[in-house]
């Protein structure tokens, strides 16, 4: 099955067999204004220098304008996530204008001559912009360019051949192979728009990288770290279908991008929030859900415009689906004791109860070893909102690092069955909310009652809004 | 209105190669593509392939692989389907149908079909 | 390739009777899912499209619902004309497939 990439194996190949496609003519950039939201209507093609179709059309001069962008096909149809963006631009902006960009005769072809291919195609749009300036009310701050892989970085072409400054691109997994590490001029880059804000789904750093892994834009959003998006796997394209292959986690993750973007379209009252973060580990740890200083922002549609002198990347994690929010939980826990725990790495569940839902048990990742007499900082993210936090359930399971480690705790258990009871002393924990930025402090219900051992529970309550506690020295981990 | 006109019906032996034609009137031709579908005796339906007229590009079903050529003449509205090395098994009705431009499109005109029949 | 499959293979019934048909895809096809009617010796004919989109001029005694992998089309009340062969079709990845079709028959 076609997409926009095919499976890794199939690009690689792309990069390096020639192919022969049947086309006869060498053919232009066609401009398909969409004039209605049903995927049948033909819509009407614009013609550069010809007026005529602008006004049989109703093609809106003071509102604003997206140019949807494909990228690289195999197939030469479009794919379906096209309608998709179509509908939902319509669903929102019911007054503007939206234009797809048909440059299939170009895309569909050698993935080399494709890319060779992006800039007379971004020179095509840029043309067309200065034209349509010419018109009286068209202003180019009104202008949106959105484009998907190869169409991103079509994007960037046009953006910087236009005369004067187009409002804004959105990138939707810019296409990787060819681009990452490219001179600015040669991709997308913060230079091409008056802000440019990309999302990354398909990155990563060992084998073939089908979305772009630099950040290009202003904001750089990185979805789940942007590169294992939620309801992709093989397990879960197995599970959904009876003949699931690498071909469709490949598309699932690449075109995630672009169903981040419709959901942002069509679930404005549903917005995902992302936060900046110098990497996806940290992020993971849970230390990078700070608002302050422009630290956070609505992803997709409905980010705000920030021009930074440099790339912010940002993250957050989603559902596997739409409406793709989730809330997210900074949870520091002060471990103030060990006992007993030989070469044992503890790992933590918590169950959240809030005013309008309970979440399920959730284990907190562990990026790093926990630390014992320290502030340990965990990520933690429910897909349903549970309104107020009011207490929270821990539990915990001794993991062996390793299969050595792991018989030497039997071998110890076996020589000494009376051995006391490993347990942990976690007296507190702090959480802070990413998505309404509020700090609560939780205490252990019974004071005197602090140790866990594996598999039993420690109940907590909320006993303060705020995180300072007195005569207490700051956490080793402070937010950004 | 608009209209998908295919050629005659056709006898081939085995080994042979058979190339039908559709003609479109009542719409533009170039704004949606052309796909083509075969019914075998009593059969289902089975998708060969589509050409996107504008350019020619083309997309077949693996099935068919390198046995089935598709490609169009612009200046006569016309699309083409060449399936060689026919067999046995190739005997059937071939439409084509129009579609528009979105893989979810529904093929909403169709051919009235050609009867290929392949016999030694 | 995505596999529809059509139930029942072949259906008796009355002029005025409800009929419904199901198809069920191998995989979630994010309903775009078209129906076709096709009658002997003739081409087939689009009825519905995006699982419940009625085409031009087909009459309003048909419709269509369903999601994710199951669809069905209803005739909320049989018609003499309406006896043929009916076949679903998936428009969410290529290879383009269809049901194996539902063969409507007066009793």
């Known amino acids: 099955s076609p997409t926009p990439f095919g499976p890794e194996g199939q690009l690689a190949d792309e990069l390096h067999k020639p192919k022969a496609i049947q086309t006869e003519v060498k053919p232009s950039v066609r401009f398909n204004l969409r004039t209605s939201k049903d995927p049948e209507h033909e819509g009407c093609y614009l013609s550069l220098g010809h007026s005529q179709p602008l006004e049989d059309c109703g093609f809106n001069m003071t509102a604003k304008t997206f140019f949807i962008i494909h990228g690289w096909t195999m197939s030469g149809i479009f794919e379906n996530w096209l309608h998709k963006l179509v509908s939902a631009l319509h669903t929102r902006e019911k007054d503007a204008n939206v234009v797809v960009v048909d440059w299939l005769p170009l895309a569909h072809q050698l993935y080399t001559d494709a890319v060779n291919n992006t800039r007379v195609v971004g020179h095509s749009i840029a043309r067309m912009l200065d034209w349509l300036q010419e018109k009286d009310d068209f202003s180019l701050g009104n202008v949106h360019l959105i484009g998907y892989s190869l169409g991103a970085h079509v994007a960037g072409y046009a953006g910087n051949f236009v005369k004067g400054t187009v409002g804004r691109i959105t990138g939707l997994d810019p296409a990787g192979p060819m681009f990452e590490g490219a001179d600015i001029h040669k991709r997308l880059s913060p230079d091409d728009a008056d802000f440019v804000d990309v999302l990354h789904t398909y990155t990563r750093s060992f084998g073939l990288s089908i979305g772009i892994q630099m950040p290009v834009g202003h904001i750089d959003i990185y979805p789940n770290g942007g590169d294992f998006q939620p309801g992709c796997g093989l397990n879960d394209v197995l599970g959904s279908m009876a003949y699931g292959t690498i071909t469709e986690v490949v598309k699932c993750e690449h075109e995630r991008a672009v169903h981040l973007f419709v959901d942002s379209l069509v679930n404005q009252d549903k917005p995902s929030f992302a936060f900046q973060c110098t990497d996806s580990n940290r992020f993971k740890k849970g230390i990078c859900l700070s608002c302050r200083k422009n630290r956070c922002n609505s992803i997709g549609y409905n980010a705000k415009k920030m021009r930074n002198k440099r790339n912010s990347k940002m993250y957050l994690k989603t559902r596997a689906g739409m409406p793709f929010r989730v809330y997210h939980y900074q949870m520091k826990i002060h471990v103030f004791s060990y006992k007993n725990m030989g070469e044992i790495e503890p790992t933590f569940y918590v169950t959240l109860y809030g005013t309008n839902a309970d979440s399920q048990t959730l284990p907190l990742e562990i990026v790093e070893r926990i630390e014992q007499n320290a502030t340990n900082t965990f990520l933690v993210y429910t897909e349903e909102d549970l309104g107020d936090l009011l207490k929270i359930q821990l539990t915990w399971e001794g993991a062996s690092q390793s299969w050595y480690n792991l018989w030497k705790e039997l071998r110890s258990y076996l020589s000494q069955p009376h051995n006391p009871g490993r347990e942990l002393n976690i007296r507190r924990i702090r959480v802070k909310s990413g998505e309404t930025q509020r700090k609560l402090t939780f205490c252990a219900e019974d004071p005197e009652n602090t140790s866990i051992s594996p598999g039993r529970e420690l109940w907590f309550r909320k006993c303060r809004d705020g995180w300072r506690m007195k005569n207490e020295t700051s956490p080793t981990v402070e937010l950004p | 209105q608009v209209q998908l006109v295919q050629s005659g019906a056709e006898v081939k032996k085995p080994g042979a190669s058979v190339k039908v034609s559709c003609k479109a009137s009542?719409?533009?031709?170039?704004?949606?593509?052309i796909h083509w579908v075969r019914q075998a005796p009593g059969q289902g339906l089975e998708w060969m392939g589509h050409?996107?007229?504008?350019?020619?590009?083309?997309n077949n079903n693996e099935k068919f692989k390198d046995r089935v050529t598709m490609t169009r003449d612009t200046s006569i509205s016309t699309a083409y389907m060449e399936l060689s090395r026919l067999r046995s098994d190739d005997t059937a009705v071939y439409y084509c149908?129009?579609?528009?431009?979105?893989?979810?499109?529904?093929?909403?005109?169709w051919g009235q079909g050609t009867t290929v029949t392949v016999s030694s | 390739d995505i596999q529809m499959t059509q139930s029942p293979s072949s259906l008796s019934a009355s002029v005025g009777d409800r009929v419904t048909i199901t198809c069920r895809a191998s995989?979630?096809?994010?309903?775009?899912l078209n129906w076709y009617q096709q009658k002997p010796g003739k081409a087939p004919k689009l009825l519905i499209s995006?699982?419940?989109k009625l085409h031009s001029g087909v009459p309003s005694r048909f419709s269509g619902s369903g999601s994710g992998t199951d669809f069905t089309l209803t005739i909320s009340s049989l018609q003499r004309e309406d006896f043929a062969t009916y076949y679903c079709?998936?428009?969410?990845?290529?290879?383009?497939?269809f049901g194996q079709g539902t063969k409507l028959e007066i009793k």
């Open positions: 149908a129009r579609k528009g431009i979105y893989y979810s499109s529904p093929f909403d005109y």
């Open positions: 009542g719409y533009t031709f170039t704004d949606n593509t």
């Open positions: 050409i996107n007229p504008y350019y020619g590009g083309t």
């Open positions: 995989q979630d096809i994010n309903n775009y």
């Open positions: 995006y699982t419940s």
């Open positions: 079709q998936q428009g969410n990845t290529l290879p383009f497939t």
